[in-house]
Interface confidence: medium
């Protein structure tokens, strides 16, 4: 049998195989050693007994999508039946005090491969034997601790395979420079040691994607915005846009990345090399946010130019090649422009990523301030309690709810939270009365909210003993305004 007979039904065309050559991978036209590595079709009854105590599940994941030219990493993790785990020596053991359907096991081992390899290797002096080989006959790599690696993973994609000896978890990275754009299938078959041969224990497949578009995500944050995920934001407050480029293999680390923003509000185009940008919408309405990310990435060199022709083809929008002529005179040294190039790459290519969102801008509460605090005299039956009136103003829309959170002086341990609806006039001036049980210093967080916004101010107050001569004091004053201004409070004691 050949690898493609064993590993998958999907046969890529000769063109695909020729143009998707993966470095270090082998053609699936190679022969498969079926004596050492038996092949079982799906539904074969032997799968039931391939593992003691149940079935092993293989989970295949990747960090797809991958920008063409970057590395994509595949990870396979084996999930053993309940109560089983791999120990430090690579043996499969029962977890202590773990009860499965068969009850507690007297034998600590599910598979004691250390004992097997000592008893049955029959090796020559080099530590090599005829059965310590992969399905294609290549010998196992003899790096330190290789005997503790008891699983054989065979990865298969694009008409090629890659063999790896490992433990219950392995990772394989593939460079995508030669991979055709679009979705591709990765299949993995896992074998375990079984005396002088191997037994299949799991098969898994997963789709991965190679793209010429930079994968781009944008997070949006705005102070006072009640729900950051609904793409509704507040007028007259800056929104922070943060661009996240999915580049797990750091392919673009050496690239100059440009971010071109159009906020859809006739403020024009804004270009930046910074992945974060702030923008303030000054009108209500719905706006189309557009971002184009452009990066210079290592890429294939274009073929030598043909003899000049009268008309010049227009480069495609998705990718524009740039070659680097090492004879070009430069400003310094032998070839100073090498400084800005990726090592060992002769050419670069423009790669683009796009993000679009529709943003709704509405009125919201922009700011809240405590402008006055008044100690309200309590009747005699409550000598330990203090009533305090907070006079609060706000800017922006009219709030419908007020909440006060009273906590310890560090503002970390909440003692009391009270929320109540409010009916405020156009001036946005309201009085909030709260009770403080006992003297001391308190942190007061006061929020005003409506459907779309939530504005906060905080202050430390010092509540004195119930001595008529001692006035209410601000212990310290602070709030969460961007300009870090301190609040000015006017204290009145009755």
């Amino acid at each position: 049998k050949r690898f493609h007979d064993v590993l998958g039904n999907e046969r890529p065309s000769a063109y695909m195989r020729e143009h998707n050559q993966l470095n270090g991978w082998s053609s699936d036209e190679n022969d498969w050693n079926e004596k050492l590595y038996p092949v079982w079709k799906r539904g074969d009854m032997r799968w039931k007994n391939s593992w003691k105590g149940g079935r092993v599940q293989a989970v295949l994941t990747s960090d797809s999508p991958a920008l063409v030219g970057s590395n994509i990493t595949f990870a396979v993790n084996l999930i053993f039946p309940r109560c089983q785990k791999e120990d430090a020596n690579g043996n499969i053991v029962y977890e202590k005090n773990c009860r499965n359907e068969a009850g507690l096991s007297a034998d600590p081992y599910v598979y004691n491969w250390t004992a097997w390899s000592e008893d049955s290797d029959g090796e020559n002096g080099t530590g090599q034997s005829h059965h310590n080989v992969f399905p294609d006959g290549k010998p196992f790599p003899h790096h330190p601790g290789w005997r503790r690696w008891n699983f054989i993973y065979v990865f298969h994609t694009l008409g090629q395979y890659f063999q790896k000896l490992g433990r219950c978890s392995v990772r394989v990275s593939v460079n995508t420079a030669n991979v055709t754009l679009g979705p591709q299938l990765m299949e993995v078959t896992v074998y375990r040691r079984h005396g002088r041969a191997y037994v299949p224990i799991a098969q898994v497949k997963d789709v991965y994607v190679v793209t010429d578009q930079i994968p781009v995500f944008v997070t949006m944050f705005q102070k006072n915005d009640r729900n950051s995920s609904d793409e509704t934001f507040l007028k007259d407050l800056p929104i922070m846009f943060d661009v996240l480029i999915h580049d797990p293999s750091h392919f673009l680390n050496y690239s100059t990345i440009n971010y071109k923003w159009s906020f859809g509000d006739n403020t024009g185009l804004f270009v930046s090399t910074n992945h974060t940008v702030n923008h303030t919408y000054v009108l209500n309405g719905t706006f189309s946010l557009n971002l184009t990310v452009k990066a210079a990435a290592p890429g294939p060199c274009p073929p030598p130019p043909p003899p000049p022709r009268p008309s010049k083809p227009t480069p495609s929008l998705a990718t524009t090649l740039k070659s680097y002529d090492s004879n070009t005179p430069g400003p310094a040294g032998d070839n100073p422009l090498e400084l800005s190039r990726i090592p060992d790459e002769n050419c670069q290519i423009n790669r683009y990523g796009h993000f679009q969102a529709t943003i709704t801008i509405v009125e919201g509460i922009l700011e809240v301030n405590i402008i006055q605090m008044t100690d309200v005299l309590m009747p005699v039956p409550w000598p330990e309690s203090s009533l305090i009136d907070f006079v609060v103003t706000c800017q922006g829309s009219i709030p419908t709810e007020v909440c006060t959170i009273i906590s310890d002086p560090t503002c970390e341990i909440t003692q009391n939270t009270v929320c109540s609806p409010v009916d405020v006039d156009e001036m946005c001036l309201l009085t909030v009365r709260r009770t403080f049980n006992g003297s001391g210093t308190y942190c007061v967080n006061l929020t005003l909210g409506d459907d779309t916004s939530l504005a906060l101010t905080s202050t430390l107050i010092s509540v004195p003993d119930r001595d008529p001569a001692s006035p209410l004091r601000m212990a310290n004053e602070f709030d969460y305004k961007d300009d870090d201004d301190k609040l000015e409070h006017h204290h009145h004691h009755h």
Epitope: T256, N258, K260, V271, S272, T273, N274, K294, A296, P315, L317, T320, K322, S323, Y324, D325, T328, P329, G330, P331, P336, L337, L339, S340, R341, Q348, N350
Partner: antibody, heavy 122, light 106 residues
Framework: QVQLVQSGAEVKKPGASVKVSCKAS????????MGWVKQRPGQGLEWIGA????????NYNQNFAGRVTMTVDTSISTAYMELSRLRSDDSAVYFC???????????????WGQGTLVTVSS | EIVLTQSPSSLSASVGDRVTITCSAS?????MHWYQQKSGTAPKLLIY???NLASGVPSRFSGSGSGTDFTFTISSLQPEDAATYYC?????????FGGGTKLEIK
């Protein structure tokens, strides 16, 4: 060797437009961004913007946004900078400069044109 | 935008002197470039990427620094060094230049 040759001096009236050209030779035109810099008489240097000739991706200084347009004609390796709605304070020498390979911030303007004097006067 | 503050704005020195010009950035940057401009001509790149000497530039010119503080030095002043010197950053848009330092020979 690398050369940037700019168009000749211009005299314009306020409100008019001016288009300055910069012809590049001696290197692959699409490999480097082309920047434009303004210098008023006796003053310092002010960056107007830059264009990547490979795809006409532009980046303008906000101080000039809305009035400046940068373009290229790759078939003749020439960059253009057009400034509209001219004012008296636009009277200056305008330089084109070959900027870092592939827009890299690691390299400054390694080659400069000789400058084009634009005079705005009624 | 990143503001580059050059000092001094002008200085006078004798042939053979060691001359130092500083450039302070309002935010941290990775690379600083230095130019020389003589009257009626285009600026000429002397130093790129903070400390690299541009092609054909004499070794008496050097640059150093990191973060927000950068220095340009002429180790032994020559008569032909009379010019205005500018620092320049292209780490953040818009690119900006320092205000310039006019260097005269005594």
């Amino acid at each position: 060797q690398v050369q940037l040759v700019q168009s000749g001096a211009e005299v314009k009236k306020p409100g008019a437009s001016v288009k300055v050209s910069c012809k590049a030779s001696g290197y692959t035109f699409t490999d480097n961004w082309m920047g434009w810099v303004k210098q008023r008489p006796g003053q310092g240097l002010e960056w107007i913007g830059a264009i990547d000739p490979s795809d006409s991706f532009t980046n303008y200084n906000q101080n000039f946004a809305g009035r400046v347009t940068m373009t290229v004609d790759t078939s003749i390796s020439t960059a253009y900078m057009e400034l509209s709605r001219l004012r008296s304070d636009d009277s200056a020498v305008y330089f084109c400069t070959r900027s870092g390979y592939y827009g890299s911030p690691k390299l400054g303007g390694d080659y400069w044109g000789q400058g084009t004097l634009v005079t705005v006067s009624s | 935008e990143i503001v580059l503050t050059q000092s001094p704005s002008s200085l006078s020195a004798s042939v053979g002197d060691r001359v130092t010009i500083t450039c302070s950035a309002s935010s941290s940057i990775s690379y600083m470039h230095w130019y020389q401009q003589k009257s009626g001509t285009a600026p000429k790149l002397l130093i790129y990427s903070t400390s690299n000497l541009a092609s054909g530039v004499p070794s008496r010119f050097s640059g150093s620094g990191s973060g927000t503080d950068f220095t340009f030095t002429i180790s032994s002043l020559q008569p032909e060094d009379a010019a205005t010197y500018y620092c320049h950053q292209w780490n953040s848009y818009p690119c900006t230049f320092g205000g310039g330092t006019k260097l005269e020979i005594k």
